[in-house]
């Protein structure tokens, strides 16, 4: 906490400008009017303040707005946002997507911090829904965001939002989440031709039912083993040896290396040995 001292004569700041970088912490505290700072927050980012100086500016805003900053100030926080704690952020009422974007931009390229997580949760909770624009914004900044959502929340995601999803965005999704996302992806990509459709749907197949896998096996898709290993065990078990062979195409040889792992292990145990032998891989049921 900075001690209260009178502002030296002639140092009272008429506006927020570069001259303030030469002010000591106590001078900033004494000579910068908090209300002026609040109205000229957009200038702070253009000035190379030290972390210690930013602490003073934050302290001034905290004193001015003990119940939480207004959105007009929040939108222009810029790098000062990095100084905020989750406790500070939970006092805010951010309703504008533009404000959210401005704050996410500050943290761009970094992992989702507790501050950002609190901001996002409060924003979405305050809206009471995860609309397309919000979801598209969040997945643009945090590609893995989709897999942090509950199956319940994902159920309200519009199929149109699925278009922007990249395969790596789904890396951390669990089967329950893919169960919800797969039918949406199927709907979103339904008008694409066979090979294009498979490229798009491939990363969602962890939620596909048996009948869809059977249909894919008729389309010469050559599914790779990594995708096959992510399929639902209950969806793979009813597939015949011929269907799996068609589904995997030249990748069928990879079954041997995965024979002790699910779902391959469980699928092998369900097949007749005569059928497995037709693959010529030495798989034992």
């Amino acid at each position: 906490e900075v001690e209260k001292t009178a502002c030296p004569s002639g140092k009272k700041a008429p506006e927020i400008d570069e001259s303030l970088i030469f002010y000591k912490k106590w001078e900033l505290e004494a000579c910068v009017d908090a209300a002026l700072l609040a109205t000229q927050m957009d200038r702070v980012n253009a000035i190379p303040f030290t972390y210690e100086q930013l602490d003073v500016l934050k302290h001034k805003l905290d004193e001015l707005y003990p119940q939480g900053y207004p959105e007009s100030v929040i939108q222009h926080l810029g790098y000062l946002f990095l100084k905020m704690s989750p406790e500070d952020i939970r006092k805010w009422n951010v309703t504008s997507l533009e404000t959210l974007k401005a704050l996410l931009e500050v943290n761009k390229g970094h992992e989702m911090s507790p501050q950002v997580a609190t901001l996002i949760d409060r924003f979405v909770k305050g809206r009471g829904q995860l609309d397309k624009d919000t979801l598209d914004t969040l997945t643009a900044f945090y590609p893995g965001y989709l897999c942090s959502l509950s199956p319940e929340e994902l159920s309200s995601v519009p199929p149109s939002s699925i278009w922007a999803v990249r395969p790596q965005d789904l890396d951390t999704c669990d089967p329950r989440q893919l169960d919800v996302l797969y039918p949406k992806a199927r709907l979103a990509f339904q008008n694409m031709n066979g090979s294009e459709y498979f490229v798009k749907i491939q990363s969602f197949l962890g939620g596909a039912p048996t009948e869809d896998l059977k249909a894919l096996s008729q389309q010469n898709v050559s599914m790779d083993l990594a995708t096959f290993m992510k399929l639902r065990t209950d969806a793979v078990l009813p597939l015949t040896v011929a269907e799996v062979q068609k589904l995997l195409g030249p990748h069928v040889e990879g079954l041997k290396a995965e024979e002790r792992h699910r779902p391959v292990r469980d699928w092998i145990l369900r097949q007749r040995q005569d059928d497995l032998d037709t693959l010529g891989l030495g798989l034992q049921g």
Epitope: D121, S150, D174
Partner: antibody
Framework: DVQLQESGPGLVKPSQSLSLTCSVT?????????WNWIRQFPGNKLEWMAY???????NYNPSLKNRISIIRDTSKNQFFLRLNSVTTEDTATYYC?????????WGQGISVTVSS | DIQMTQSPASLSASVGETVTITCRTS??????LAWYQQKQGKSPQLLVY???TLENGVPSRFTGSGSGTQFSLKIDSLQPEDFGTYYC?????????FGGGTKLEIK
């Protein structure tokens, strides 16, 4: 401020249907959120029963699925619970609540007794 | 369905003490957990959502933590108004289920 208020009969006979209304003020039920029914049994155990979402879609607790329905009247900003074939086991305090990541607004609850 | 195991079922403590209530889930719910406080004859009140975010107006002596299947609610420096029953609830997928409750009584 969002306010929720339950209304309906305090006493229902076994095998009959229970119908409850939740009236919402201060927020449109079509603008956002999940609008839930929860009940609390005499031993204080809480049970989530159903929700109707802002977009009109709904979801039920499978333990009640074959005898429960939830609908809404957007013109009156109300949503309703209907529970069929009630038994004495359905005696509880029934709450309506608004939720997203948690049930942040609740009605004061209505006590319902099932008895002949 | 995801089962919620809350412990202890009851707890006696004095004003000024620190207490911790735990909630274990039968499946991974990431951080989709809420904590409530209920006073006799009143509706439950949301304290914490997404495992650790305090609801508006909730004093900072309440702290939620955990993710996956293990969660806890810590109350520092208990105040007279903190006594009541506490419940956890998951929001991962329906049916949403509640813990059995922890009755916090004044010693």
């Amino acid at each position: 401020d969002v306010q929720l208020q339950e209304s309906g009969p305090g006493l229902v006979k076994p095998s009959q249907s229970l119908s409850l209304t939740c009236s919402v003020t201060g927020y449109s039920i079509t603008s956002g959120y999940y609008w839930n029914w929860i009940r609390q049994f005499p031993g204080n155990k809480l049970e989530w029963m159903a929700y109707i979402r802002y977009d009109g879609s709904n979801n039920y607790n499978p333990s009640l699925k074959n005898r429960i329905s939830i609908i809404r009247d957007t013109s009156k900003n109300q949503f309703f619970l209907r529970l069929n074939s009630v038994t004495t086991e359905d005696t509880a305090t029934y709450y309506c609540a608004k939720s997203y990541y948690g049930m942040d607004d609740w009605g004061q609850g209505i006590s319902v007794t099932v008895s002949s | 369905d995801i089962q919620m195991t809350q412990s202890p079922a009851s707890l006696s403590a004095s004003v000024g003490e620190t207490v911790t209530i735990t909630c274990r889930t039968s499946g991974d719910i990431h951080n989709y957990l809420a904590w409530y406080q209920q006073k006799q004859g009143k509706s439950p009140q949301l304290l914490v959502y997404k495992a650790k975010t305090l609801e508006n107006g909730v004093p900072s002596r309440f702290t939620g933590s955990g993710s996956g299947t293990q969660f806890s609610l810590k109350i520092d420096s208990l105040q007279p108004e903190d006594f009541g029953t506490y419940y956890c609830q998951h929001f991962w997928t329906t049916p949403y289920t509640f813990g059995g409750g922890t009755k916090l009584e004044i010693k």
